[in-house]
């Protein structure tokens, strides 16, 4: 529970409680920002990127966005509260346990973007159509 | 009853050094995950740092990769985090926070200790 010597600020995102006052803890992501990628038709990919950061929010989300254009492909992973957009989209599948790329329309490149809600699932990158489908079997195991 | 109780706080210069701890009472300490937190003046809450039961993995906030470093000693049921290369922005009071068990609930805190970067 929040102690109360802990002092609320007048707009604190920071603090994030359930039902019984307990603290919530931000998700774990990996957070490389924008590295080169070496990710190419492959059905999923690993980031490659060694830093796991915790989220400076505890509503905040793991992002990746992979993108390619005549020059190199690049693949971004942080973290990011699915209330605001990102490179101009929503979030939608915030809530997935997976990251499952979807393709957004952007001019002059091919652009890929997932966000997830497991701890560091922006680690593992999945094109694959056969992940695109709702499937009940896949439980958000958070952080336990 | 579980207790925490945080010492190591004061004074310090920017570049300077401290190390705070945090005892333990009252729980099985080496079964749950810990945290360190902190709340800057007029400011919200930052989770700084994480550790698991047994010590590793540790996780870091951006703002002190690379600077901080959390450690527990479980057959001394106590927490640590040395903190280098301080900066004004680091000046808060810090928090010891245990896990529940469940999600990712923190439910006890401690009452905390004063850091203050200033020259």
């Known amino acids: 529970t929040i102690p109360p010597h802990v002092q609320k600020s007048v707009n604190n995102d920071m603090i994030v409680t359930d039902n019984n006052g307990a603290v919530k803890f931000p998700q774990l992501c990996k957070f490389c920002d924008v590295r080169f990628s070496t990710c190419d038709n492959q059905k999923s990919c690993m980031s490659n990127c060694s830093i796991t950061s915790i989220c400076e929010k505890p509503q905040e989300v793991c992002v990746a966005v992979w993108r390619k254009n005549d020059e190199n492909i690049t693949l971004e992973t942080v973290c990011h509260d699915p209330k605001l957009p990102y490179h101009d989209f929503i979030l939608e599948d915030a809530a997935s346990p997976k990251c499952i790329m979807k393709e957004k329309k952007k001019p002059g490149e091919t652009f890929f973007m997932c966000s997830c809600s497991s701890d560091e699932c922006n680690d593992n990158i999945i094109f694959s159509e056969e992940y695109n489908t709702s499937n009940p079997d896949l439980l958000l195991v958070i952080f336990q | 009853e579980v207790q925490l109780l945080e010492s190591g706080g004061g004074l310090v210069q920017p570049g300077g050094s401290l190390r705070l701890s945090c005892a333990a009472s009252?729980?099985?300490?080496?079964?749950?995950?810990m945290a360190w937190v902190r709340q800057a003046p007029g400011k919200g809450l930052e989770w700084v740092s994480l550790?698991?039961?047994?010590?590793?993995?540790?996780y870091y906030a951006n703002s002190v990769k690379g600077r901080f470093t959390i450690s527990r000693d479980n057959s001394k049921n106590t927490l640590y985090l040395q903190m280098n290369s301080l900066r004004a922005e680091d000046t808060a009071v810090y928090y010891c926070?245990?896990?529940?068990?469940?999600?990712?609930?923190?439910?006890?805190w401690g009452q905390g200790t004063l850091v203050t970067v200033s020259s």
């Open positions: 926070a245990k896990y529940s068990g469940q999600g990712r609930d923190f439910d006890y």
């Open positions: 009252g729980f099985t300490f080496d079964k749950y995950k």
């Open positions: 550790i698991f039961p047994n010590g590793v993995p540790t």
